[in-house]
């Protein structure tokens, strides 16, 4: 297992809907074919995995379809976008790269992006 | 290194707007938020709000809802803060902060007095 | 939203002394987002202390912090003359991110 560097932001606000994106860039030493891409989620000390989705380069990455993860791929870049984001969601995020195929394996892990995400404000009744 | 400098004071009667700069330099602007923090004479430090670099999106104390807007212009990694409708109670010095989380670096602070 | 408060008010404490500085948070807040800040009277807040227990660049090894949950301490360990001034802790656990009133630590 060799080591890569990933770089990600530090920080990022998820919207009012409660959708964050953010990039994940890996500084790739080689030709990969297969890369894996996991989002992990630490907070009070516990770390549990968010999503994963591996992909063939020039592919779109496939999360399960009851993933909360999207994204796509460009080249050494993986666009990741998580949804359904509440207040209590609020953590760091951390994206972990493996370069699956063809050997040697690589395996980076980013310094995490902290989302940040606030509950909407509930609409007032309205009477009609 | 990490700097941010500070747009200078303001004098602003009240109902006026004021709106002060924040420049950062020695770090990558976008991958980092930019808090803004009060302090009125003599009291301590009140948080105002903070905007997302990374994609623009803000969040702002209930108290400043309505009145405030927090910009950025990542062409030259400046931050904006817009208070309007200024009154006497607005009176403070305003402090950029790199974060959250932790605010790590701060600006030498803008004393912004509104007075008629 | 996560109120912090801090104690006491006032601690009025001779150069060489121990000064204890106590934060309560009125819910449990991650100790990787507590931090503690000194305010000199005409300079900007200096961050002092993040994650609780984990020391700024620059700052000198008589300060130290430690706690979790809800209750957070910063420790002097033996005064000196320019460690007088107020401290804050604040928690960007959740937003909004929040202060503690302060504490002024003066020369007795």
């Known amino acids: 297992c060799k080591a890569m560097h990933v770089a990600q932001p530090a920080v990022v606000l998820a919207s009012s809907r409660g959708i964050a994106s953010f990039v994940c860039e890996y500084a790739s030493p080689g030709k990969a074919t297969e890369v894996r891409v996991t989002v992990l989620r630490q907070a009070d000390s516990q770390v549990t995995e968010v999503c994963a989705a591996t992909y063939m380069m020039g592919n779109e990455l496939t999360f399960l379809d009851d993933s909360i993860c999207t994204g796509t791929s460009s080249g050494n870049q993986v666009n990741l976008t998580i949804q359904g984001l509440r207040a209590m969601d609020t953590g760091l995020y951390i994206c972990k790269v493996e370069l699956m195929y063809p050997p040697p394996y690589y395996l980076g892990i980013g310094n995490g992006t902290q989302i940040y995400v606030i509950d909407p404000e509930p609409c007032p009744d309205s009477d009609f | 290194q990490v700097q941010l400098v500070q747009s200078g004071a303001e004098v602003k009667k009240p109902g006026a707007s004021v709106k002060v700069s924040c420049k950062a330099s020695?770090?990558?602007?976008?991958?980092?938020?930019i808090s803004w923090v009060r302090q009125a004479p003599g009291q301590g430090l009140e948080w105002m709000g903070w905007?997302?670099?990374?994609?623009?999106?803000?969040n702002y104390a209930q108290k400043l809802q309505g009145r405030v807007t927090m910009t950025t212009d990542t062409s030259t990694s400046t931050a904006y803060m817009e208070l309007r409708s200024l009154r006497s109670d607005d009176t403070a010095v305003y402090y950029c902060a790199r974060g959250p989380p932790t605010l790590h670096y701060w600006g030498q602070g803008t004393l912004v007095t509104v007075s008629s | 939203e996560i109120v912090m408060t801090q104690s006491p008010a006032t601690l009025s404490l001779s150069p060489g002394e121990r000064a204890t500085l106590s934060c309560r948070a009125s819910q449990s807040v991650s100790s990787n987002y507590l931090s503690w800040y000194q305010q000199k009277p005409g300079q900007a807040p200096r961050l002092l202390i993040y994650g609780a227990s984990t020391r700024a660049t620059g700052i000198p090894a008589r300060f130290s912090g430690s706690g979790s949950g809800t209750d957070f301490t910063l420790t002097i360990s033996s005064l000196q003359p320019e460690d007088f001034a107020v401290y804050y802790c604040q928690q960007d656990y959740n937003l909004p991110l929040t202060f503690g009133g302060g504490t002024k630590v003066e020369i007795k």
């Open positions: 020695g770090y990558t602007f976008t991958n980092y938020g």
């Open positions: 905007i997302s670099v990374y994609n623009g999106n803000t």
